[in-house]
């Protein structure tokens, strides 16, 4: 009995049939972060819950030290949402005075680190200007896309300012990936 | 001929190979909602189109009475977008007067209901402050992530204010899930 | 040995088992666009990078002339993010004068074109009012959902104003689809 009776004839030899429930998958949820001072041009990585509540890792997808470790090569869908919250930015005062100003901003980056490659690769970026007048503000940035990843790659989520991340609920700020 | 010739040796017995086209899937689209009285701390659920236009349910994934019914246990990708639209909020007047104010907000929650468990579980939340001055406004909130769901679980989409939901186009407000 | 020993008995005959790595997939990334005259009620399509950097097409999913070509019928997850950036809109001046105004807006549409059908179908729309005072602004719109597509369908991303699209980084503006 030939394999091609079960799959189209263009099936690659290196990609055998496999059970879907066996694929590497993770959904990580927010935890309380160290509220570090905002450093210009240096985006800190978030750390995550990997086993309590809605969070899980399975099928050799492991989480360690802010990184999701990719256990096998393939195409992965990678996603994250970060909910930010903050007070009125100084920008608003300048705006009220009628002078244009480069606004404050919030940014999320999903980054890939490959040990054999010196520079991290930015896979996804969501960046938004924030110029609020006279109020507290809060808003999410959502990202998600498919990437070809290699065994041993590591994924992390970086943010422009860790002290603005809403860590209060696991459904507000999260990070995940699954092999397609 | 052994099953493991088609799948890696770590394939679980309980997860047999299966055709992808056979997996439970649904994409639901917005319909005109019944305007409900806005209740503090209680977010109403949206109801949905499940068979006309772009909407569909298949492979035992059913829609009934605002709920998507999960027909088999497994890992699902669940997503929704809700487009909100509204008039200037009171918040803007307070802001114009220069007094800080807790802003109006818009919120979407994807909720899981398990009959055997008394409390619903919030899977995903997108929440955004809205403090617009002197104009109509409109904006989407998008959510999506992977969750381990059980047969019999029910999913719904709740919003902070049903009267602000844009129900005019099926591509603006939608809700879906598929077994991975 | 029967196929149903590997898949549940409700497996459709037309959906044989197949290797996941063999499915049509694409992730396209932004390139510098040709600035087009902004036409009212006509949203221009973006063109994309399909092979350099993070971009790829595989397994008969092809990109040509702004379109992703669907090579086989099935359920696809389709997604895009477009990051917009702009200067203060006129809207802000009108707002400062205290007169309500229909705000400027930014819109992304993922559109399906079927040669046998005269009218394109809007699959997904993200639309947002933009009414910024006294500053440059930037923000992303993210979209993603599952659709039943037919062999020969073509997908494109349209935007309300091509001159506002941030084409500077491949992680900020992108478009993808994969067969589930």
């Amino acid at each position: 009995l030939k394999g091609q009776e079960f799959a189209p004839s263009h099936q690659q030899v290196y990609a055998p049939l496999r059970a879907d429930g066996d694929k590497p998958r993770a959904h990580l949820t927010v935890v309380r972060q160290t509220p570090t001072q905002h450093l210009k041009n240096q985006f800190p990585a978030l750390h995550w819950e990997h086993e309590l509540g809605l969070a899980f890792t399975k099928n050799r997808m492991n989480y360690t030290n802010k990184f999701l470790l990719i256990p096998e090569s393939g195409d992965y869908f990678v996603y994250s949402q970060v909910t930010f919250r903050g007070m009125t930015s100084e920008c608003s005062e300048i705006r009220q005075a009628g002078r244009p100003n480069k606004p404050d901003s919030i940014t999320v980056v999903i980054t890939k680190v490959t040990d054999s490659y010196p520079e991290p690769t930015q896979l996804l970026m969501g960046t938004k200007s924030v110029c609020e007048v006279g109020s507290n503000w809060f808003q999410p940035i959502y990202l998600g896309a498919m990437f070809s990843l290699q065994e041993g790659d590591k994924l992390m989520v970086n943010v422009s300012d860790i002290s603005l991340v809403d860590y209060t609920k696991e459904d507000k700020t999260f990070f995940g990936a699954f092999l397609l | 001929l052994k099953g493991q010739e088609f799948a890696p040796s770590h394939q679980q017995v309980y997860a047999p190979l299966r055709a992808d086209g056979d997996k439970p899937r649904a994409h639901l689209t917005v319909v005109r909602q019944t305007p409900t009285q806005h209740l503090k701390n209680q977010f109403p659920a949206l109801h949905w189109e499940h068979e006309l236009g772009l909407a569909f349910t298949k492979n035992r994934m059913n829609y009934t009475n605002k709920f998507l019914l999960i027909p088999e246990s497994g890992d699902y990708f669940v997503y929704s977008q809700v487009t909100f639209r509204g008039m200037t909020s009171e918040c803007s007047e307070i802001r114009q007067a220069g007094r800080p104010n807790k802003p109006d907000s818009i919120t979407v929650v994807i909720t899981k209901v398990t009959d055997s468990y008394p409390e619903p579980t919030q899977l995903l939340m997108g929440t955004k402050s809205v403090c617009e001055v002197g104009s109509n406004w409109f904006q989407p909130i998008y959510l999506g992530a992977m969750f381990s769901l059980q047969e019999g679980d029910k999913l719904m989409v709740n919003v902070s204010d049903i009267s602000l939901v844009d129900y005019t186009k099926e591509d603006k407000t939608f809700f879906g899930a598929f077994l991975l | 040995l029967k196929g149903q020993e590997f898949a549940p008995s409700h497996q459709q005959v037309y959906a044989p088992l197949r290797a996941d790595g063999d499915k049509p997939r694409a992730h396209l990334t932004v390139v510098r666009q040709t600035p087009t005259q902004h036409l009212k009620n006509q949203f221009p399509a973006l063109h994309w990078e399909h092979e350099l950097g993070l971009a790829f097409t595989k397994n008969r999913m092809n990109y040509t002339n702004k379109f992703l070509l669907i090579p086989e019928s099935g359920d696809y997850f389709v997604y895009s993010q477009v990051t917009f950036r702009g200067m203060t809109s006129e809207c802000s001046e009108i707002r400062q004068a205290g007169r309500p105004n229909k705000p400027d807006s930014i819109t992304v549409v993922i559109t399906k074109v079927t040669d046998s059908y005269p009218e394109p179908t809007q699959l997904l729309m993200g639309t947002k009012s933009v009414c910024e005072v006294g500053s440059n602004w930037f923000q992303p719109i993210y979209l993603g959902a599952m659709f039943s597509l037919q062999e020969g369908d073509k997908l494109m991303v349209n935007v309300s104003d091509i001159s506002l699209v941030d084409y500077t980084k491949e992680d900020k503006t992108f478009f993808g689809a994969f067969l589930l």
Partner: antibody, heavy 120, light 107 residues
Framework: QVQLQQWGAGLLKPSETLSLTCAVH????????WNWIRQPPGKGLEWIGE???????NYNPSLKSRVTISLDTSKNQFSLTLTSVTAADTAVYYC??????????????WGQGTLVTVSS | EIVLTQSPGTLSLSPGERATLSCRAS???????LAWYQQKPGQAPRLLIY???SRATGIPDRFSGSGSGTDFTLTISRLEPEDFAVYYC????????FGQGTRLEIK
């Protein structure tokens, strides 16, 4: 050595507003959570809420509607306001620093405590 | 919110004996967020153990912590006179909570 010194009115009437301030000496505001915790006489500890250097707050859900925590970074101080007090709010109120590094979090420094009595 | 239940409410022991204090959570708690404090009359609480099992600076090694998930234990291997006080466990999730306390008194 970090020291937290707190002060505020000790005797209030029902429906009045409680106000306490905590000054941080010998340490930075940045990188920590600044908390208020209370202890009714002869009872256990109850967390009230926290603020970080960016001004973001997080409150105990049972007190959220009445609590405001604010900070003044120029003076290295943070403050607690609790509105519409009743006799049930009688307690020793403590300020405390919340320390988080990697995934480990705890209260490492505490103020001396202020007894607030609500009585008509 | 996560409810922490301490037992026993009061523990009567003599100096030199071993004390075992229990803290049970209503749902799983990250071990790294579980701490123990000692409080003496008229004083603020003092950190003893953090991360469920790490001793704070200056805490004698007769104090030890253990446990994970929902069950945590503070052990004082050999009681000294100054150890008689009230002990609280605490979890530092998004909404921190304390146990109701265990009073350790001289028998």
């Amino acid at each position: 050595q970090v020291q937290l010194q707190q002060w505020g009115a000790g005797l209030l009437k029902p429906s009045e507003t409680l106000s306490l301030t905590c000054a941080v000496h010998g340490g930075s505001f940045s990188g920590y959570y600044w908390n208020w915790i209370r202890q009714p006489p002869g009872k256990g500890l109850e967390w009230i809420g926290e603020i970080n250097h960016a001004g973001n707050t997080n409150y105990n859900p049972s007190l959220k509607s009445r609590v405001t925590i604010s900070l003044d970074t120029s003076k290295n101080q943070f403050s607690l306001t609790l509105t519409s007090v009743t006799a049930a709010d009688t307690a020793v109120y403590y300020c405390a620093r919340g320390y988080c590094r990697s995934t480990t979090c705890y209260f490492d420094y505490w103020g001396q405590g202020t007894l607030v009595t609500v009585s008509s | 919110e996560i409810v922490l239940t301490q037992s026993p409410g009061t523990l009567s022991l003599s100096p030199g004996e071993r004390a075992t204090l229990s803290c049970r959570a209503s749902q799983s708690v990250r071990s790294s967020y579980l701490a123990w404090y000692q409080q003496k009359p008229g004083q603020a609480p003092r950190l003893l153990i953090y991360g469920a099992s790490s001793r704070a600076t200056g805490i004698p090694d007769r104090f030890s912590g253990s446990g994970s998930g929902t069950d945590f234990t503070l052990t004082i291997s050999r009681l000294e006179p100054e150890d008689f006080a009230v002990y609280y466990c605490q979890q530092y999730g998004s909404s921190p909570t304390f146990g109701q306390g265990t009073r350790l008194e001289i028998k």
